[in-house]
Interface confidence: low
């Protein structure tokens, strides 16, 4: 698997992973104790025909071109967890691994 | 996990799995011996805020709203393989399990 990495200066128009720091304090998410911010990253860009397609299925749907199929879109294809310390609904402090919080790779699907 | 199933008569505008039969003969993919056609399905529809979101990350990116982030899109969240008999590049007949050929579930990511 392969994915492009870009930054805010990139001229790349295709599907790419961009840096994004999520700041829980800025969102007012005061139930999160730690981390207060983390590098989440996000996916953005065009999905031209066969570029970074994760699945052969994507190519086949493009060929068949059914009503309403919008073509592939740029979306996370590999994600990883982060460890978080937070209050749950019962005001208990929980330490846990929260899945799919960081985008490691972007692709077209 | 949960996903909607629709058909061509559905009035559902949200992210949904639709039936699609892929016909290899119609594509001129003559290197595929069997199956000649199979039920692939595809994803289509709107991803309104938090509907069928697969990852918490999707919600966070929506909150942070970075330059160029396009919002979640309707994409396969569960896929399965099919067994295929085909010619490889060396004209050898191969029987193998090809991953991610069938969409089992759609979601917003």
């Amino acid at each position: 698997d392969f994915g492009l990495d870009c930054d805010e200066h990139s001229t790349e128009s295709r599907c790419c992973r961009y840096p994004l720091t999520v700041d829980f304090e800025a969102f007012g998410w005061d139930w999160i104790i730690a981390p207060k911010r983390y590098k989440a990253n996000y996916c953005s860009g065009e999905c031209e025909f066969v570029f970074l397609q994760k699945y052969p299925h994507t190519h086949l749907v493009h060929q068949a071109n059914p009503r309403g199929s919008a073509g592939p879109c740029c979306t996370p294809t590999k994600m990883s967890p982060i460890n978080m310390l937070y209050f749950n609904g019962k005001e208990q402090i929980i330490y846990g691994k929260i899945p799919a919080m960081v985008v490691d790779r972007c692709g077209c699907s | 996990d949960f996903g909607l199933d629709c058909d061509e008569h559905s009035t559902e505008s949200r992210c949904c799995r639709y039936p699609l039969t892929v016909d290899f003969e119609a594509f001129g993919w003559d290197w595929i011996i069997a199956p000649k056609r199979y039920k692939a399905n595809y994803c289509s529809g709107e991803c309104e805020f938090v509907f069928l979101q697969k990852y918490p990350h999707t919600h966070l990116v929506h909150q942070a709203n970075p330059r160029g982030s396009a919002g979640p899109c309707c994409t396969p969240t569960k896929m399965s393989p099919i067994n295929m008999l085909y010619f490889n590049g060396k004209e050898q007949i191969i029987y193998g399990k090809i991953p991610a050929m069938v969409v089992d579930r759609c979601g917003c990511s």
Epitope: F2, L4, S10, T11, E12, S13, R14, E46, E48, F49, V50, F51, L52, Q53, H62, G71 | -
Partner: antibody
């Protein structure tokens, strides 16, 4: 076979516009980016931009951005490049070129088919 | 924009010679470089992509090498039909930029 056939030579006055066409045949037009490249007489090649017929998304060289528009007509498998406010230094041969994408990496492509070129002469 | 500098700008050689044309990028472009051949009055023709991969149908006497900022095109044994102008192109980022060309002439 895959072919790109461009419109004929044009002579234009400074300040006018020109619209060059590039008709594709022998392949699925919507599936491949079309690029436009120009070449002034006796000079090198200059990339102008591209368009993806599948969704109409285009990328322009900043140098031309204010004056160029690339469009496609999928019903006729034709790409168009319009250049406005023509100047004498826009005199050039304009080429369309298909970007052939064979893989999944960002550089897994090349220009496999070119149009024959359209000479645009800007002269008062 | 990424600047592509080709050298030499012109080159005289004889049939049977081995010639090398170089292309230097103003910044790292990985292996995202193509080479073209152009004959007078004709459209360019792709020879090499991704720095060293030969386009289908192009004879193996053409070869490419390099990565990062320095690239070369080599023609191992010149034939009369090889006398033309050669261009490199970086496709690492927009705008795509070409070298200024190398004119290969018969000595």
């Amino acid at each position: 076979q895959v072919q790109l056939v461009q419109s004929g030579a044009e002579v234009k006055k400074p300040g006018a516009s020109v619209k060059v066409s590039c008709k594709a045949s022998g392949y699925s037009f919507t599936g491949y980016f079309m690029h436009w490249v120009r070449q002034a007489p006796g000079q090198g090649l200059e990339w102008m931009g591209n368009i993806y017929p599948y969704n109409g998304v285009s990328n322009y060289n900043q140098r031309f951005k204010a004056r160029v528009t690339m469009t496609t007509d999928t019903s006729t498998s034709t790409a168009y490049m319009e250049l406005r406010s023509l100047r004498s230094d826009d005199t050039a041969v304009y080429y369309c070129a298909r970007r052939y994408y064979y893989g999944t990496g960002p550089a897994d492509w090349y220009f496999d088919v070119w149009g024959q070129g359209t000479l645009v002469t800007v002269s008062s | 924009d990424i600047q592509m500098t080709q050298s030499p700008s012109s080159l005289s050689a004889s049939v049977g010679d081995r010639v090398t044309i170089t292309c230097k990028a103003s910044q790292d472009i990985n292996s995202y470089l193509s080479w073209f051949q152009q004959k007078p009055g004709k459209a360019p023709k792709s020879l090499i992509y991704r720095a060293n991969r030969l386009v289908d149908g192009v004879p193996s006497k053409f070869s490419g090498s390099g990565s990062g900022t320095d690239f070369t095109l080599t023609i191992s044994s010149l034939q009369p039909e090889d006398f033309a102008t050669y261009y490199c192109l970086q496709c690492d980022e927009f705008p795509l930029t070409f070298g200024q060309g190398t004119k290969l002439e018969i000595k």
